[in-house]
């Protein structure tokens, strides 16, 4: 596959990754699809440094990231190991709260107004951040 050596227009480069910050809201699954349509993924936070960078760009606004537990355990969309990786949950989160009255619990993670993470209903229309890595051969279609 072809290697991406610089970020697309309107994306922000940081530490050999490219980031795109939305200014509108979408449900988690729709945001995920839009990132993947651009050969990217919802942002995967792997360090405190990356957390600070993203937090600086999104401001105090609820914003989806690429972390969910829709199939049971918490998983990052790019396969990064959740258990051993960076975490920045708010105290007592995630709580899979059912009291919102929207049906089900809370299966998708987002940055809150102070940057720390919370789990929430995946259908909520929050802003989102896409990420794609530089110097990585772009994914090829699977062989049929």
């Amino acid at each position: 596959g072809s290697e991406r050596t610089c970020c697309p227009v309107n994306w922000v480069e940081h530490e050999r990754s490219c980031y795109w910050f939305s200014r509108s809201g979408k449900a988690w699954a729709d945001a995920d699809n839009y990132c993947r349509l651009e050969d990217a993924h919802l942002v995967v936070v792997t360090s405190w440094e990356e957390q600070k960078f993203v937090q600086h760009h999104i401001g105090p606004v609820n914003t989806w990231m690429g972390l969910h537990d829709q199939n049971g355990p918490w998983k990052w969309v790019d396969g990064t190991d959740y258990e051993t990786g960076f975490k920045n949950w708010r105290p007592e989160q995630p709580d899979d709260w059912y009291g919102h009255g929207l049906g089900g619990g809370e299966d998708c993670a987002h940055f809150t107004d102070d940057g720390r993470w919370n789990d929430d209903v995946c259908q909520r229309p929050y802003r989102w951040v896409c990420e794609t890595e530089l110097d990585k051969a772009s994914q090829e279609p699977p062989l049929l």
Partner: antibody
């Protein structure tokens, strides 16, 4: 000038297969996500499938999932739609369409002229 | 999936007159709405995106408005090439869905 030219349509029996192609020119093909949209005779438009610029990510309407496969050859600036297990309700003009090219902008700024697929015994 | 409806199905207008077309979504699509014009036997052409932004090369007689579930396309003075079918498309939610179209014919 952006141009999209579809080919491969025709008459096919129910259960049969067909492969549509779309030849693109006038833009950097590999930089844009692409899509197939169809229009049954006398009906409205229906989104069928989409594919990312690299071809690594694909998306399908529920009505075609498991039967249709979208792919692309960026070295030849060509988009494909492999259609298997065709049904009468798949009869339509199939358009190749280019996404606008901004994240979250799921609309189409250029369309081909379409190719007619007729599924009938 | 989000269902898009359009009204009226057909609109009879004289050249030079104003035409107002309506598009409604079954749930909010914010401002993620596009309008297309399709002439008989031709591909659709993008007119408006983001509910109100004219696409490149689209004349000022076309204007779009609305957000949430109610949208309007207005053609201020119909020209001969405007007699066609107009359809709306939401792209807020996957799958993308289109309205059935409004046909403008000559009165």
């Amino acid at each position: 000038e952006v141009q999209l030219l579809e080919s491969g349509g025709g008459l096919v029996q129910p259960g049969g297969s067909l492969r549509l192609s779309c030849a693109a020119s006038g833009f950097t093909f590999s930089s844009y996500a692409m899509s197939w949209v169809r229009q049954a005779p006398g009906k409205g438009l229906e989104w069928v499938s989409a594919i990312s610029g690299s071809g690594g990510n694909t998306f399908y309407a529920d009505s075609v999932k498991g039967r249709f496969t979208i792919s692309r050859d960026n070295s030849k600036n060509t988009l494909f739609l492999q259609m298997n297990s065709l049904r009468a309700e798949d009869t339509a003009v199939y358009y190749c369409a280019k996404f606008f090219g901004i994240v979250g902008a799921g609309y189409f700024d250029y369309w081909g002229q379409g190719t007619l697929v007729t599924v009938s015994s | 999936e989000i269902v898009m409806t359009q009204s009226p199905a057909t609109l009879s207008v004289s050249p030079g007159e104003r035409a107002t077309l309506s598009c409604r979504a079954s749930q909010s699509v914010s401002s993620s709405l596009a309008w297309y014009r399709q002439k008989p036997g031709q591909a659709p052409r993008l007119l408006i995106y983001g509910a109100s932004t004219r696409a490149t090369g689209i004349p000022a007689r076309f204007s779009g408005s609305g957000s949430g579930t109610e949208f309007t396309l207005t053609i201020s003075s119909l020209q001969s090439e405007d007699f066609a079918v107009y359809c709306c498309q939401q792209y807020n939610n996957w799958p993308f869905t289109f309205g059935p179209g409004t046909k403008i014919d000559i009165k």
